[in-house]
């Protein structure tokens, strides 16, 4: 057959679906690879063909669209499972072609099992809620297109194994789950189960997401440098090791890039000739506030090094701060025989 533009296996789209639930999977060609949509392609006389390779097999085979109750069907650029079975796991390919044009892409589909508490190997999306910030909502994700707007599904929300009914601060409101005032104790996995009828059958869609309660923007402050500070003086003799920690607290800020860096005499350590190493560690509070520590280390400090200016800098979306470390050369202790004796007027 003629050449086909093969986009390979699109592992960025690792699609996971639950066993025994409907799944609608759009051909990724129109979403990520081609500059036109399915309608345009269809009007131009292009045909969309689906096939698959079963798990642990190499053989590409056509998808059987003649299963009882149309279990697998295609509608425009969507492949439908009503419902999935465990052995539907494999690599699926959609190919767009006519006599002169061909383009195809494959993607992995994994059908996963869950238990009655919705534990499964499914990768869960994380939804961040601000702590004590007023009413915030999460919405049951990825249920669009499964049923027409005329169908009114029933939605049940769970936390872990248990149905959310009369929570103190969490209220199910159809497709939304409202948190009246989010607290650390609200951290966890929340599941919505959407039940809808179709052609005399009842289908369930299960969607689990992780809620993480984070610091509120109301409480956010610019970076705070805890160290270096005015109370600690780094007094060293030449030849000793100089270690200066720069410890900075960052309030949680959505999508903020937190940065910490040292300058020595106004230059980045990489831009000067002294033998300096910097080690960084990061820790997070329960609300994802961040503490970054960068330890500046000079193994064998010289008297010149002890005269330099060492400044710790920090930046977040809330602002930029800097603090100089107090570094000085230790005055050698007087040697008794000479200095003290002279001091006492000995001759």
């Amino acid at each position: 057959s003629e050449r086909c533009d093969d986009w390979g296996l699109d592992t960025m789209r690792q699609i996971q679906v639950f066993e025994d639930e409907p799944a609608r999977i759009k051909c990724p060609l129109f979403e990520h690879f081609l500059k036109f949509n399915y309608s345009t392609a269809h009007s131009a006389g292009l045909t969309l063909i689906w096939y698959w390779t079963r798990q642990d097999r190499d053989l590409e085979e056509p998808i059987n669209f003649r299963l009882p109750e149309n279990r697998i069907s295609k509608e425009k650029d969507v492949l439908w499972f009503r419902p999935t079975l465990l052995n539907d796991t494999g690599n699926y390919t959609c190919m767009l072609r006519n006599t002169t044009y061909c383009s195809k892409v494959a993607f992995p589909l994994e059908v996963v099992q869950k238990d009655s508490c919705f534990n499964s190997p499914m990768k869960l999306p994380v939804h961040k809620l601000y702590i004590e910030y007023g009413i915030q909502r999460i919405t049951c994700p990825n249920v669009d297109g499964y049923f027409p707007s005329s169908v009114k599904p029933t939605i049940t929300w769970y936390m872990g194994c248990y149905k959310i009914q009369n929570f103190n601060n969490v209220i199910p409101e159809g497709m939304n789950l409202s948190f009246l005032i989010a607290l650390i104790s609200n951290n966890g996995n929340y599941t919505c189960v959407v039940t809808y009828p179709e052609n005399g059958r009842t289908f369930h869609l299960t969607r689990t997401l992780t809620v993480k309660v984070v610091g509120s923007p109301k409480n956010a402050v610019p970076p705070v440098i805890h160290s270096p500070n005015d109370h600690v003086v780094y007094e060293k003799e030449p030849g000793e090791e100089l270690l200066i920690p720069c410890t900075v607290y960052f309030s949680f800020l959505m999508d903020s890039r937190n940065e910490v860096w040292w300058t020595i005499d106004g230059k980045k350590p990489d831009d000067i000739t002294i033998d300096v190493t910097i080690n960084e560690s990061i820790s997070h509070s329960r609300t994802e506030d961040e503490t970054r520590t960068q330890i500046l280390s000079i193994k064998k400090v010289t008297s010149e090094d002890l005269k330099r200016s060492y400044v710790c800098h920090a930046r977040s979306a809330k602002g930029e701060v800097a603090k100089a470390a107090k570094v000085k050369q230790k005055v050698p202790a007087p040697r008794y025989t000479v200095e003290l004796a002279c001091g006492f007027g000995a001759t």
Epitope: D115, F118, Y158, C161, N168
Partner: antibody, heavy 120, light 107 residues
Amino acid sequence: QVQLVQSGAEVKKPGSSVKVSCKASGGVFSGYAISWVRQAPGQGLEWMGGIIPEFGATNYAQKFQGRVTITADESTSTAYMELSSLRSEDTAVYYCARHSSAYSPWFDYWGQGTLVTVSS
Amino acid sequence: EIVMTQSPATLSVSPGERATLSCRASQSVSSNLAWYQQKPGQAPRLLIYGASTRATGIPARFSGSGSGTEFTLTISSLQSEDFAVYYCQQYNNWPWTFGQGTKVEIK
């Protein structure tokens, strides 16, 4: 060491209600779930329902729906199971059992059991 | 609901011998199965969850296997304290259900 201490034995008349308590000590109450499981004399185990005390989120076995109410008081780390419209076949030992987390459907700590006898 | 069937109802074994207990589910429960031990007058004790993972503090002589509908609890060398009733529990579907139990008695 986590301990679940249940209230004492009860003798009840048919048609009445019983409320059994289960107090957790030596471990945090929050973040866990508590289930109630019963065992009729010489019989196997039967799960009735459970609760996440922190939130009051509950689930009940269909068989007991409408007849059982599971509640919890976080301030005293105590869970309660109330069974109404008692009949003779409700005579059993009632256990509270802690899940190892809110997401774990198995039970890692159990109370000592409360015998409820329903007799006219 | 899923019906859990345990066999045999009673198993007579000598101390030091191996005991193999079976649990069958009326439909697939994947690996969502736990095993418990119960001694007379006591509450059950968790032995195994996830069909094969030993709970904290459970001796290595207890092992679980199986998935789908067929499961086995094996006690490799019975000790005197192992004579008890053993229950399996599925938690794949609501309601969670238990088997009727297998009594392991001294031969």
